[in-house]
């Protein structure tokens, strides 16, 4: 059910870790695996967690994998995840984790946490 | 420690309300959702409502406008405001730290009996 | 809704017995390639407990006598050694459609 906005405090965390992510970030993250690209106009914690779900083995991701399963407990609907995903576009999540954190950085100055 | 409280059961007449509270500790409680789920006595488990770290909130059709889940990430606490009680909502309620549909209730609370019954 | 169908509803076995219990579900729970199948363990008079999350994955700090496997619709909870410790009830739940929805339960007790 649709609902009131995210509190900041939980975006001010999920962003705060990939702040972190981006900082510490000495190898290639998650041994330069790739994630598929996402829709960031709809549903982003969900397209997010989808995409990062299929990541195993990275610790330096886990953190933020919870917290995006935080945000989305429950699965959206089963035809709302093709408009998630940008079609057959895959990019490291090194890169997937700066473009999250722009947009969400966007959302956070703009208000806009749902 | 890391630990899951619940409280505010009781006995409540058929179309009462009762409050029931989950008091968290030993993790970050904002960054998780937290759900309720049930159990009436000698039976299995039922799902009664999930809210996200974004205050979304998720509930069943059997008790969806009836019940509703709301959390205070400053108190680090769950709740669950029961109105419109009826005898087949006669359980054990647990509270729960919901990892999402990719990982499961991953903590539970003892459990608090409401008993509705005139 | 989907439905979780557990077999058996009770069995009873003796220490060091490997045990089998089975949950189907009323239609596929498979997303992504993932199955979204979770199993607990409840002893009376308390809290149940996760063991294994998306169908075979044990969860931190369980015994590796437990195991679990499947997709689509049947799944299995396998103890490879019963210990005195496991005499308890087993639910499976999904989470690949709201609303979520349990097993009936399958209660282990000693033979």
């Known amino acids: 059910s649709p609902s009131p906005v995210p509190p900041s405090t939980a975006l001010k965390e999920l962003i705060e870790e990939l702040v972190n992510i981006t900082q510490n970030q000495k190898a290639p993250l998650c041994n330069g695996s790739m994630v598929w690209s996402i829709n960031l106009t709809a549903g982003v914690y969900c397209a997010a967690l989808e995409s990062l779900i299929n990541v195993s083995g990275c610790s330096a991701i886990e953190k933020t994998q919870r917290m995006l399963n935080g945000f989305c407990p429950h699965k959206v609907s089963a035809g709302q995840f093709s408009s998630l995903r940008v079609r057959d576009t895959k990019i490291e999540v090194a890169q997937f984790v700066k473009d999250l954190l722009v947009h969400l950085k966007k959302l956070f100055r703009e208000g806009q946490f749902n | 420690e890391v630990q899951l409280v619940e409280s505010g059961g009781g006995l409540v007449q058929p179309g009462g309300s009762l409050r029931l509270s989950c008091a968290a500790s030993?993790?970050?409680?904002?960054?998780?959702?937290m759900s309720w789920v049930r159990q009436a006595p000698g039976k299995g488990l039922e799902w009664v409502a999930s809210?996200?770290?974004?205050?979304?909130?998720y509930y069943p059709d059997s008790v969806k406008g009836r019940f509703t889940i709301s959390r205070d990430n400053a108190k680090n606490s769950l709740y669950l405001q029961m109105n419109s009680l009826r005898a087949e909502d006669t359980a054990v309620y647990y509270c729960?730290?919901?990892?999402?549909?990719?990982?499961?209730?991953?903590?539970w609370g003892q459990g608090t009996l409401v008993t509705v019954s005139s | 809704d989907i439905q979780m169908t557990q077999s058996p509803s009770s069995l009873s076995a003796s220490v060091g017995d490997r045990v089998t219990i089975t949950c189907k579900a009323s239609?596929?729970?498979?997303?992504?390639?993932?199955?979204?199948v979770h199993w607990y363990q409840q002893k009376p008079g308390k809290a149940p407990k996760l063991l294994i999350y998306?169908?075979?994955n044990l969860e931190s700090g369980v015994p590796s006598r437990f195991s679990g496997s499947g997709s689509g619709t049947d799944f299995t909870l396998t103890i490879s050694s019963l210990q005195p410790e496991d005499f308890a009830t087993y639910y499976c739940?999904?989470?690949?459609?709201?609303?979520?929805?349990f097993g009936g339960g399958t209660k282990v007790e000693i033979k």
């Open positions: 729960a730290r919901n990892e999402g549909y990719y990982f499961g209730l991953t903590l």
């Open positions: 030993g993790f970050t409680f904002s960054s998780y959702a």
């Open positions: 809210i996200s770290s974004g205050d979304t909130t």
């Open positions: 239609e596929s729970v498979d997303h992504f390639g993932w199955s979204l």
């Open positions: 998306r169908a075979s």
């Open positions: 739940q999904q989470s690949n459609e709201d609303p979520w929805t």
